[in-house]
Interface confidence: medium
């Protein structure tokens, strides 16, 4: 045995591997260094999850993951004397954590959340297959800017879906949106299996509708100017401009990726305002415009949730039918 062992020699396994849950979905494994490790070994720890995913070699004796605890999750940990991935680590020690007890068929399904206008989050879910129709639900949530887990108070019904909404305002701190909201739904009586979800704050963002400020004609072009929803900068949004002409009964939709107010016809330097020129519009007919917006992948992971349509605004004259 002794202190002169070569660093390539397999190290003893780590000791006291344990697992705990913090918040709602932060799973933390901690362990102690191996007993009797070689004295000339600078200890590193090799770890991966049960499916051989997310391999990591690091000197820390802890590893954490943010994961919805709807399924069992296991971490395997071994020790080694270098950061070399090809070095054979010690015997791997495994520790698993299982989701809370309960009939899987009782857990709510379709649990999803949308961050509305970066100001409040609205989550909704469907009762589980084996659930009494009069089950009362509670939603709990946690994110980095909260000291403790909060209970959502505003439970509502929308058709067959249950839901709850809670305030969640974008903080000026630039790292705020790099985090997630952890969600858990269970019933008050403790009869159903809890369901978990993790909502990254860069996804599932639904802006408020924009507000049309001005429509004007210049030659045969229609200039549209609008105010973007609060909390969003224009470069983070894509737009859809819909123009309906009452006389020709045409319905044109323009997908706009950039909406700068650079033409002299547009009112300048108005904060958070975007503009678009619709070509070839007949000024002597009635044109009705509405706009919607969605987040783009320059700033967000998700670009699927359109806002509702803005209020319509019309310009031009309705011709008398003869």
């Amino acid at each position: 045995g002794g202190g002169g062992a070569a660093p390539t020699e397999t190290q003893p396994p780590v000791t006291n591997l344990s697992v705990s849950v913090e918040n709602l979905c932060t799973v933390i494994w901690t362990w102690n260094p191996p007993e009797g490790a070689s004295s000339n070994c600078s200890l590193w720890y090799f770890s991966h999850f049960g499916d051989k995913q997310d391999k990591k070699i690091a000197p820390e004796t802890r590893r954490s993951i943010e994961v919805p605890l709807n399924e069992r999750i296991c971490l395997q940990v071994g020790s080694q004397c270098s950061t070399n991935e090809s070095e054979k680590p010690s015997i791997l020690v495994e520790k698993c954590i299982s989701p809370p007890e309960g009939d899987p068929e009782s857990a709510v399904t379709e649990l999803q959340c949308i961050w509305h206008n970066l100001s409040y989050m609205k989550c909704s879910w469907l009762p589980g297959r084996n659930t009494s129709p009069d089950t009362n639900y509670t939603l709990y949530y946690w994110h980095r800017s909260l000291e403790k887990i909060h209970q959502c108070e505003n439970i509502f019904r929308e058709g067959q879906y249950f839901g709850c909404s809670f305030d969640l305002t974008k903080v000026k701190d630039s790292s705020f949106e790099q985090h997630s909201v952890q969600i858990m739904v269970k019933d008050n009586a403790g009869k159903i299996k809890p369901s978990f979800n993790i909502v990254p704050l860069t996804s599932r963002v639904k802006p408020d509708p924009p507000h049309i400020k001005n429509l004007s004609f210049h030659n045969d072009d229609l200039y549209v100017q609008w105010e973007n929803p609060q909390n969003f900068i224009s470069r983070c949004l894509f737009y859809e401009v819909e123009v309906n002409n009452s006389q020709t009964e045409t319905h044109n939709v323009f997908y706009v990726q950039e909406a700068k107010c650079e033409n002299p016809e547009f009112e300048r330097n108005v904060e958070n305002t975007s503009c678009f020129m619709v070509p070839g519009v007949l000024p002597d007919t009635l044109n009705t415009v509405r706009i919607r917006v969605k987040t783009n992948k320059l700033c967000y992971e998700d670009d699927k949730l359109w806002s509702n349509w803005s209020q319509e605004m019309s310009i031009g004259k309705k011709r008398n039918s003869t």
Epitope: T109, E110, P127, R129, S132, P133, E158, G159, Q160
Partner: antibody, heavy 119, light 107 residues
Framework: EVQLLESGGGLVQPGGSLRLSCAAS????????MNWVRQAPGKGLEWVSV????????YYADSVKGRFTISRDNSKNTLYLQMNSLRADDTAVYYC????????????WGQGTLVTVSS | DIQMTQSPSSLSASVGDRVTITCRAS??????VAWYQQKPEKAPKSLIY???SLQSGVPSRFSGSGSGTDFTLTISSLQPEDFATYYC?????????FGQGTKVEIK
């Protein structure tokens, strides 16, 4: 006023396929589960399948599992039932039925469309 | 699967009669039973849900009761338009199942 209008029924040979549609109006379609329930000639009612409002969750009766597929297009307010490997005992009037707010019983029914499986 | 057994399978009654139809579940289903009315060549119509709650627009002569395994649909004073077939349905657990029906005929 809630209205459900089925279509797509007809005569089909055993082993054949058919796709039923149900056009819905008069309610917010995408927040209610929709069902297919069938009734063989002179017989009682048999629940066939259900799909949740967002179209994510589906359940089937054992008698049709693996052969029938329920789906919906919320942009068109339309429910579908794709029926494959049809058998003589699938002959029935097929009703689409709206789930109530508890997504379990049926508060509105369509008028039904007849599917006949025969050679 | 939960079996729903209705009785009687048919009955004859006169206008003004009080009519009672029972439905027995093969296992306890709390109060998760609905009742439907079906007339010949027509779609079923919802009458009662959650054992005793009247669907909107349904006349108050219809009432439901029961919990656990035994459920009852009562028509307090039979009207000409009530001659039809009545079905119970359980929605406590999948697959949802119906009773075999009770035909109410004119005596």
């Amino acid at each position: 006023e809630v209205q459900l209008l089925e279509s797509g029924g007809g005569l089909v040979q055993p082993g054949g396929s058919l796709r039923l549609s149900c056009a819905a109006s008069g309610f917010t379609f995408n927040i209610y589960a929709m069902n297919w329930v069938r009734q063989a000639p002179g017989k009682g009612l048999e629940w066939v399948s259900v799909i949740s409002g967002r179209g994510i969750t589906t359940y089937y009766a054992d008698s049709v599992k693996g052969r029938f597929t329920i789906s919906r297009d919320n942009s068109k307010n339309t429910l579908y039932l794709q029926m494959n490997s049809l058998r003589a005992d699938d002959t029935a009037v097929y009703y689409c039925a709206k789930g109530s707010s508890s997504w379990t019983d049926f508060d509105y029914w369509g008028q039904g469309t007849l599917v006949t499986v025969s050679s | 699967d939960i079996q729903m057994t209705q009785s009687p399978s048919s009955l004859s009654a006169s206008v003004g009669d009080r009519v009672t139809i029972t439905c027995r579940a093969s296992q306890g289903i709390s109060r998760w039973v609905a009742w439907y009315q079906q007339k010949p060549e027509k779609a079923p119509k919802s009458l009662i849900y959650a054992a005793s709650s009247l669907q909107s627009g349904v006349p108050s002569r219809f009432s439901g009761s029961g919990s656990g395994t035994d459920f009852t649909l009562t028509i307090s004073s039979l009207q000409p338009e009530d001659f039809a077939t009545y079905y119970c349905q359980q929605y406590n657990s999948y697959p949802w199942t119906f009773g075999q029906g009770t035909k109410v005929e004119i005596k």
